[in-house]
Amino acid sequence: AGTPEVWVQVQMEATELSSFTVHCGFLGPGSISLVTVSWGGPDGAGGTKLAVLHPELGTRQWAPARQARWETQSSISLALEDSGASSPFANTTFCCKFASFPEGSWESCGSLPPSSDPGLSAPPTPVPILRADLAGILGLSGVLLFGCGYLLHLLRRQKHRPTPRLQPSHTNSQALTAQAWAPSQASQAALHDPYATINTSFCPATLDTAHPNGWASLPTHAAHQPQGPAASASTPILARGSFVSVENGLYTQAGERPPHTGPGLTLFPDCRGPRALEGRFGVR
């Protein structure tokens, strides 16, 4: 089935240079229970929430978000209005966190490329990532010099060797594309405090052993870990998705009934029903 992935694409509107749109999507078999979009970093790790979208309850958004909406059942868009003349969005990291069943929470971040042509970004396609040192060598000049043909050659060559795990790099801000692909790491969460901010996420795959008070019995094995972030096909990037902060990483009990769960079991961060997701309602 493969590891779930979250993609993030940031684009400047061709008509209004002060308008940006963040597109996020989830690639995985699970049922999405919540999407959180933040800027300045991951949600709960220095980032500031811009919008929260629930597939049934609606969406919530806060300035400078202008319109948050579901584009498909597994992707969302968030339009942003940049009131400042200096266009701060251009240098900002946007992160999308998808809570899904049974995979847990997955988060990726991306930003507008330094020299992006407005309105030209195409929805990304997941492919194996380029090695960070290779991407750094190529850089923007490499992209301009050798063009798409050389990129395709690199990607083709990359497919024939194992993908290394990429560590977060101080040069992450030099990403050359708005389409940052990076599945977040998932591992087992502690049961001690269901409301604590934790650095990992685990959603029990089998909730049939959930306790009456809403706790789920966690399996003893650790959750699978993704073997490496993936990059978009458009231009070489440096991985920016190896970091993740997940709040309320346990999902059980009540209300919505995603596929393959027993009656009364669902995906809500406070383990007690739809109450535990941060805000709702749609566009202003």
């Epitope: 609606g58 059942q73 997701l277």
Partner: antibody, heavy 114, light 113 residues
Framework: EVQLVQSGAEVKKPGSSVKVSCKAS????????IEWVRQAPGQGLEWIGE????????NYNEKFKGKATFTADTSTNTAYMELSSLRSEDTAVYYC???????WGQGTLVTVSS | DIVMTQSPDSLAVSLGERATINCKSS????????????LAWYQQKPGQPPKLLIY???TRESGVPDRFSGSGSGTDFTLTISSLQAEDVAVYYC?????????FGQGTKLEIK
């Protein structure tokens, strides 16, 4: 389970202000919106607005801009709504709510009377 | 703002009988992207805050008896109580959960005949 406990009833003079509090427990206070809803005697429900305590981001119903001001104190898990320039028509029960209006405070009756 | 209009304003139904409350929105509450309707139903008993019954037009909140059901799409929605119980006497509100600001219907008072 998340609980929202509001401050007690208030009787105020026209032109004065009142600050209603809403203390949350049992959840991550800074991660979810606190909504404020008004219900005048014998009337329906009106959304006043919301605050996201972690960032103090707010959304206001246009009707209540200038009338209501939201603040939040994450150290005490308490959200506040201040109503200014009170008039008799502001007499109502004011509710705080959260998590898609699934959790509600017990309500605070604010009576404006000379 | 989206205007929510409920009908009837009041309703008297015999115990064990079916009660139906309608709600009409001035704009569609259907999101075309994921084909979900953003409408919620609440029950409010005297002296109590409202209680969430239904969200997403048809999904019952945890702990809500299965005699309560929601249906509809777009601009027309219905709350049905299949077999009225004495404890169901209350005022029922529908609510737009699609667009800011969230707006409520004027309420329908349900009584026992």
């Amino acid at each position: 389970e998340v609980q929202l406990v509001q401050s007690g009833a208030e009787v105020k003079k026209p032109g004065s202000s009142v600050k209603v509090s809403c203390k949350a427990s049992g959840g991550t206070f800074s991660s979810f919106s606190i909504e404020w809803v008004r219900q005048a005697p014998g009337q329906g429900l009106e959304w006043i607005g919301e605050i996201l305590p972690g960032s103090n981001s707010t959304n206001y119903n246009e009707k209540f801009k200038g009338k209501a001001t939201f603040t939040a104190d994450t150290s005490t898990n308490t959200a506040y709504m201040e109503l200014s320039s009170l008039r008799s028509e502001d007499t109502a029960v004011y509710y705080c709510s959260s998590y898609w209006f699934a959790y509600w405070g017990q309500g605070t009756l604010v009576t404006v009377s000379s | 703002d989206i205007v929510m209009t409920q009908s009837p304003d009041s309703l008297a139904v015999s115990l064990g009988e079916r009660a139906t409350i309608n709600c009409k929105s001035s704009q569609s509450l259907l999101n075309s992207g994921n084909q979900k309707n953003y409408l919620a139903w609440y029950q409010q008993k005297p002296g109590q805050p409202p209680k969430l019954l239904i969200y997403g037009a048809s999904t019952r909140e945890s702990g809500v008896p299965d005699r309560f059901s929601g249906s509809g799409s777009g601009t027309d929605f219905t709350l049905t109580i299949s077999s009225l119980q004495a404890e169901d006497v209350a005022v029922y509100y529908c609510q737009n959960a699609h667009s800011y600001p969230p707006t409520f219907g004027q309420g329908t008072k349900l009584e026992i005949k």
